[in-house]
């Protein structure tokens, strides 16, 4: 029943152009190129996209025309390799162009940079943006796609089209409003925050596929879709998992046209078969394509069937457990995961995968025994501590969050993680700990039944950010170990890390703790980041500092910033009071 089996097309580029339409075709090619060549100027990319589009049109007119039979990788790779400054701008990435497909595409993929050296996107004045939007809407929207894609080289391309559609709608509405800023800025903030979250979620999917393989991704998908569609049969869930895996494999592999096309087909299939999938899809399926796909991806869990029998009957008590396992190991484990997940929307996906792994390990051992049942009879008892560990962790951390509030909770995590992995760069520790801290406001408000899937699956996304940033410049064996050993045990691995006793404290550098009047004009968020950066540096200098010592220094620091920002001569205040603060902090911490 695969929705993706198509007849072979003479011209793949013509086929995708016709399926997607010119607008989406051009947008997706722009995203693909910007995700590969992240440093190239906007104008260069637009030129390449236009050339590819013109070529595609010739192929639509005549599929037998010269080069129309070439693969998309060949066509796009050839086009990218025409960039004149490839060697100067990208260094060794230029060597990819000496390779043949498919090695050339793999080479480009390996050079995607999760943390490209690009300037921060500064938002212009609203009037400036509205003028630019009205002057050339098409260029304005292309620029949005380009800027997001180059900064987020794994952004889920069909979803970026959805973001661009909302971006356009925001400007269309708000640039006509009486108070443009009041209308537009909250919408842009929302898009920015949602976009960052979407990028991070997709990055985990790609890491799962690329670092742990298709089986790992499929297991994740079985668990998540079974929670979401508990009324669907196992065969239906399996079919959706197969198709979803194809979509994400394509997008993560840079095959954005195929990915977007197949995602559209999958949405169509789901909507045509909603009766056997979920009762919650009706509203989604009435929407236009991009909204429909987004809506399906975010749809709430359907209600669980009322009459689900005990799991023990089929997976513990049955005398045919080992026979069924031998018959088709992955199918049997998939059924176990499906049955467990559809009964437990209150568990995180990673917990469900840990339980399935425990079950698999137990069967591997017990099915080799002379009396398997005697061996695996108590397997469900082994699940108890695995379930209780995240429950207890979430309970403790939500209590701490409620006590401290988000900023101070982030600070507690900053200290905790800096002590665990002090070798990691300060910007990475700040970014990751701030995001870890957001779990409080995101998830602690939920009732017990929704807390774990919210919190632990969110933490998986954030810790993957740490893993991909650390992979670029590895500095900590402990981070490498937690990131590479097991995808589902990353969070427990990091949770279990204690203070790194082998760490040699960083030399004290007064410059790190020197602040200037420019801090006063920063937004509250930027000011927090400055203070949190100082906190990480403090812990790196004095990893054995107590919570009380650090709190005292940070309180003094906050008072110092507040005082100097109120002073008439701010710069002099920062210089003089700053020296005093550094001296007092050194004394307090015994530096």
């Amino acid at each position: 029943r695969g929705v993706f089996r198509r007849d072979a097309h003479k011209s793949e580029v013509a086929h995708r152009f016709k399926d997607l339409g010119e607008e989406n075709f051009k947008a997706l090619v722009l995203i693909a190129f910007a995700q590969y060549l992240q440093q190239c100027p906007f104008e260069d990319h637009v030129k390449l996209v236009n050339e590819v589009t013109e070529f595609a049109k010739t192929c639509v007119a005549d599929e037998s025309a010269e080069n129309c039979d070439k693969s998309l990788h060949t066509l796009f790779g050839d086009k990218l390799c025409t960039v004149a400054t490839l060697r100067e701008t990208y260094g060794e990435m230029a060597d990819c162009c000496a390779k043949q497909e498919p090695e050339r595409n793999e080479c480009f993929l390996q050079h995607k940079d999760d943390n490209p050296n690009l300037p921060r996107l500064v938002r212009p004045e609203v009037d400036v943006m509205c003028t630019a939007f009205h002057d050339n809407e098409e260029t304005f929207l292309k620029k949005y796609l380009y800027e997001i894609a180059r900064r987020h080289p794994y952004f889920y391309a069909p979803e970026l089209l959805f973001f661009a559609k909302r971006y356009k709608a925001a400007f269309t509405e708000c640039c006509q409003a009486a108070d443009k800023a009041a209308c537009l800025l909250p919408k842009l903030d929302e898009l920015r925050d949602e976009g960052k979250a979407s990028s991070a979620k997709q990055r985990l999917k790609c890491a799962s596929l690329q670092k742990f393989g298709e089986r790992a991704f499929k297991a994740w998908a079985v668990a998540r879709l079974s929670q979401r569609f508990p009324k669907a049969e196992f065969a239906e869930v399996s079919k959706l998992v197969t198709d979803l895996t194809k979509v994400h494999t394509e997008c993560c592999h840079g095959d954005l046209l195929e990915c977007a096309d197949d995602r559209a087909d999958l949405a169509k299939y789901i909507c045509e078969n909603q009766d056997s999938i979920s009762s919650k899809l009706k509203e989604c399926c009435e929407k236009p394509l991009l909204e429909k796909s987004h809506c399906i991806a975010e749809v709430e869990n359907d209600e669980m069937p009322a009459d689900l029998p005990s799991l023990a009957a089929d997976f513990v008590e049955s005398k045919d457990v080992c026979k069924n396992y031998a018959e088709a190991k992955d199918v049997f484990l998939g059924m176990f995961l499906y049955e467990y997940a559809r009964r437990h929307p209150d568990y995180s996906v990673v917990l469900l995968l840990r339980l399935a792994k425990t079950y698999e390990t137990t069967l591997e051992k017990c099915c080799a025994a002379a009396d398997p049942h005697e061996c695996y009879a108590k397997v469900f008892d082994e699940f108890k501590p695995l379930v209780e560990e995240p429950q207890n962790l979430i309970k403790q951390n939500c209590e701490l969050f409620e006590q401290l509030g988000e900023y101070k909770f982030q600070n507690a995590l900053l200290v905790r993680y800096t002590k665990k992995v002090p070798q990691v760069s300060t910007p990475t520790l700040v970014e990751v700990s701030r995001n870890l801290g957001k779990v409080g406001s995101k998830c602690c408000k939920h009732p017990e039944a929704k807390r774990m899937p919210c919190a632990e699956d969110y933490l998986s996304v954030v810790l993957n950010q740490l893993c991909v940033l650390h992979e670029k410049t590895p500095v900590s064996d402990r981070v490498t170990k937690c990131c590479t050993e097991s995808l589902v045990n990353r969070r427990p691995c990091f949770s279990a890390l204690e203070v790194d006793e082998t760490y040699v404290p960083k030399e004290f550098n007064a410059e790190t703790f020197t602040f200037h009047a420019d801090i006063c004009t920063l937004s509250e968020k930027e000011r927090q980041i400055k203070k949190q950066t100082a906190l990480v540096e403090l812990v790196k200098h004095k990893p054995k500092a107590t919570k009380e010592q650090l709190k005292a220094v940070m309180d003094d620091f906050a008072a110092f910033v507040e005082k100097c920002c109120k002073a008439d001569d701010k710069e002099t205040c920062f210089a003089e009071e700053g020296k005093k603060l550094v001296a007092a902090s050194q004394a307090a911490l015994g530096l």
Partner: nanobody, 114 residues
């Protein structure tokens, strides 16, 4: 797909011997414990003997202890049951199964009669 094929059954006089063989395919035989079970005419299934994947653990029903010997050859994907001092009550269809599961094969008929 899992396939198990038993052979070696036949008609034998009381006190006689037989060696049953089970040929396995379609799964990683060397990773699974195996058993022999039997079903006498008009009776339910009776477990006879089991062996762990690495042959380190062998178990027998009280009714066959000391007379039957289970063994396996993982390289050949074969399971054996050596039956000595056969009695009329050993008459049954014998099946090899994965673990202690239910039969999914034809079995081999063993008849002990004078």
């Amino acid at each position: 797909q899992v396939q198990l094929a038993e052979s070696g059954g036949g008609l034998v006089q009381p006190g006689g011997s037989l060696r049953l063989t089970c040929t396995a395919s379609g799964f990683t035989f060397g990773s699974f414990g195996m058993s022999w079970v039997r079903q006498a005419p008009g009776e339910g299934l009776e477990w006879v003997s089991a062996i762990s994947a690495d042959s380190s653990d062998k178990r027998y029903a009280d009714s066959v202890k000391g007379r039957f010997t289970i063994s396996r050859d993982n390289a050949k994907k074969m399971l054996y049951l050596e039956m000595n001092s056969l009695k009329s009550e050993d008459t049954a269809v014998y099946y090899c199964v994965i673990g202690r599961g239910s039969p999914a094969s034809q079995g081999t008929q063993v008849t002990v009669s004078s």
